[in-house]
């Protein structure tokens, strides 16, 4: 009787952990940053090197795919930088932006969950320019939904893993 | 039999809470902000007054020490400010930055987990200047590892507890 | 005996979830943004449309009310923007700020938990200006306490739900 109770306990303990809580922390893959100054989707991210990691979520085709319904905290940190040694900026007035979007495959549609950024005047009087954006929020995500990151001026992205990354972790079940 | 089951239950309930989940929210100790205009480590933080608090983590020698393996959400908010009543800025072009670093004592090494900030032009045309940085991310931390904060231009830090702080809370066990 | 054990288990499982963990994600209600350039409290937020949602917390009189003691992660994302088509700015030197405040009704007092922002020079040389602030932190909240958002220059707020929002989710009980 005791053994059986303990056995069913461990089952429940595992279930009460709602399987293992999903998470991801994805860092920019600098070998494949798209060019351009307009809004583009960033599709190249690391998921298994350095600080990057993923569990009970999937990374595919540049998107973070939800495998488990729940409420998740989503975040992104995006750094832009320019040094005069890399040449002059085509324009000194820049719009440096990030958009965290959710795509549902069942109902093909894409919606922006969070946005952040700034217009900047990066004048030639300074040899180095830097700017970081951080956004975060709590969202209900369903299995199969996909999270992706869009930025303006991707050619200015800082390629360091501590600079440009995004992630998610599950906080709570959907009732 | 029932009493025994209930007893072992409470043990499991406690264990399933993985002891009490660690957290910390540390606020800047303005009485001891280091000087310098280059990158310096901030070692003076409050852990037990106002909004500052700590549980199942340790604060020692300016570092937040992990006592329990796990996945943690780390965050930092750093505010810089200057008012002309305190004098002039020696340079109007500033690099206002924060670096959240992890140090492992076992393998003496320090790595930046997150960085953020901006280059700023704080011209003498304005009597007051302000800028805040926020960074956050989800990281695997092992017992004994240490989290610390480095900033540029510490003499410009806003000393308020609502302005300059960092923290961590455990979200999940390592499988 | 087995049925009884399993029954008390489900009770404990529910109790161990400490009721359902509270959360809220509130998005700006753009139909009712106050005017002015000084610090004002934002009282109009959505709690049940689009990304906005609330559970085991209450939204009343422009404040997010805590119903359950605990440690919460609080966050806010505030976007400011201006396009020349909407007219000229009265001043090009702006202080764009957010303050996340906690009010206790028992001891009528209001305290700032987090602040962020930047002084900006939004010159007439550019037709569009944008700036976002993000703050986040981990705080002990008691039932009945209220969270509210104050900003400077509310007339410059970006009214999109992905731009201007704040929220909270409970991470842990108070021991």
């Amino acid at each position: 009787e005791k053994a059986m109770v303990d056995g069913s306990w461990l089952d429940l303990a595992k279930r009460s952990k709602l399987e293992a809580q999903p998470f991801a922390h994805l860092t920019i893959n600098a070998t494949d940053i798209p060019s351009g100054s307009h809004k583009v989707s960033l599709s190249s991210w690391y998921h298994d090197r350095g600080w990057a990691k993923i569990s009970n979520m999937t990374f595919s085709n540049g998107k973070l795919i939800v495998n488990q319904d729940g409420f998740y905290y989503l975040y992104a940190n995006i750094c832009f930088r320019h040094h005069e040694t890399s040449g002059d900026l085509a324009t000194e007035y820049l719009q440096l932006m990030v958009y965290v979007t959710k795509t549902s495959i069942k109902i093909p549609s894409s919606h922006t969950l969070m946005k952040g950024g700034s217009t900047k005047y990066w004048s030639g009087n300074s040899e180095f320019h830097f700017y970081s954006i951080n956004v975060g929020g709590f969202f209900k995500l369903r299995s199969g939904e996909e999270i992706s990151i869009e930025v303006s001026n991707p050619s200015l992205l800082d390629p360091d893993q501590d600079a440009t990354y995004f992630g998610a972790f599950k906080v709570r079940d959907i009732d | 039999e029932k009493a025994m089951v209930d007893g072992s239950w409470l043990d499991l309930a406690k264990r399933s809470k993985l002891e009490a989940q660690p957290f910390a929210h540390l606020t800047i100790n303005a009485t001891d902000i280091p000087s310098g205009s280059h990158k310096v480590s901030l070692s003076s933080w409050y852990h037990d007054r106002g909004w500052a608090k700590i549980s199942n983590m340790t604060f020692s020698n300016g570092k937040l020490i992990v006592n329990q393996d796990g996945f943690y959400y780390l965050y930092a908010n750093i505010c810089f400010r200057h008012h002309e009543t305190s004098g002039d800025l020696a340079t109007e072009y500033l690099q206002l930055m924060v670096y959240v670093t992890k140090t492992s004592i076992k393998i003496p090494s320090s790595h930046t987990l997150m960085k953020g900030g901006s280059t700023k032009y704080w011209s003498g045309n304005s009597e007051f200047h302000f800028y805040s940085i926020n960074v956050g991310g989800f990281f695997k931390l092992r017992s004994g590892e240490e989290i610390s904060i480095e900033v540029s231009n510490p003499s410009l830090l806003d000393p308020d507890q609502d302005a300059t702080y960092f923290g961590a809370f455990k979200v999940r066990d390592i499988d | 005996e087995k049925a009884m054990v399993d029954g008390s288990w489900l009770d404990l499982a529910k109790r161990s979830k400490l009721e359902a963990q509270p959360f809220a994600h509130l998005t700006i209600n753009a139909t009712d943004i106050p005017s002015g350039s000084h610090k004002v409290s934002l009282s109009s937020w959505y709690h049940d449309r689009g990304w906005a949602k609330i559970s085991n917390m209450t939204f009343s009189n422009g404040k997010l009310i805590v119903n359950q003691d605990g440690f919460y992660y609080l966050y806010a994302n505030i976007c400011f923007r201006h396009h020349e088509t909407s007219g000229d700015l009265a001043t090009e030197y702006l202080q764009l700020m957010v303050y996340v405040t906690k009010t206790s009704i028992k001891i009528p007092s209001s305290h700032t938990l987090m602040k962020g922002g930047s002084t900006k020079y939004w010159s007439g040389n550019s037709e569009f200006h944008f700036y976002s602030i993000n703050v986040g932190g981990f705080f002990k909240l008691r039932s009945g306490e209220e969270i509210s958002i104050e900003v400077s220059n509310p007339s410059l707020l970006d009214p999109d739900q992905d731009a201007t929002y704040f929220g909270a989710f409970k991470v842990r009980d108070i021991d």
Epitope: - | S35, G36, S37, H82, E84, T85, S86, G87, D88, L89, A90, T91, E92, L94, N153, P154, S155, L156 | -
Partner: antibody
Framework: QVQLVQSGAEVRKPGASVKVSCKAS????????IHWVRQAPGQRLEWMGW????????KFSQKFQGRITVTRDTAASTAYMELRSLRSEDTAVYYC???????????????????WGQGTLVTVSS | EIVMTQSPSSLSASVGDRVTITCRAS??????LNWYQLKPGKAPRLLIY???SLQSGVPSRFSGSGSGAEFTLTISSLQPEDIATYYC?????FGQGTKVEIK
Amino acid sequence: QVQLVQSGAEVRKPGASVKVSCKASGYDFSNYAIHWVRQAPGQRLEWMGWINAGNGNTKFSQKFQGRITVTRDTAASTAYMELRSLRSEDTAVYYCARDAANMVRGIIIAYYFDYWGQGTLVTVSS
Amino acid sequence: EIVMTQSPSSLSASVGDRVTITCRASQSISRYLNWYQLKPGKAPRLLIYGASSLQSGVPSRFSGSGSGAEFTLTISSLQPEDIATYYCQHTRAFGQGTKVEIK
């Protein structure tokens, strides 16, 4: 010990220019700012401008903008103040003074002057 | 532009007297106020910085107090060598000076 030694007295005609030097010794010249302050007969002390000896950045009082140039020679640990288009009301004792804030320890020009030169009398007369 | 106003403009006191000079700022300047001593033909000397901090080498009979917009310099026991003009200063603005003489 810290010393600031200024050049000698000068007499100029209206419309002319004057250049006063200030040689520093006893400290790392590049780590501090040098201010220029003057006192006309019977008047209060009047701040004119500063130079960050490390990077050469300058700031001037609105009153002297366009007429004043402040430079430095780090190799010679010397700061210079040139005032152009002199008029009779520029007759004054001109002082250089070191800002007490060490630039290595921060980036604020603190505006408290811990060491002063002996002063240079400039007389503007036709 | 902040304006600094000192009072009195001159005073006469006996050796050993306690002497107080007041300085008012046209707006709040926190504690960013300094005091200097100026003797004819000599370089000015920093006495007090940050409203109340005594500069190294300055006799302890000199003290400063105040914050916001009102400040005082006190000489607890006037000495013959204290005959001078005293100036308050906040960043770019100086007071008009207070001339101290011996009776």
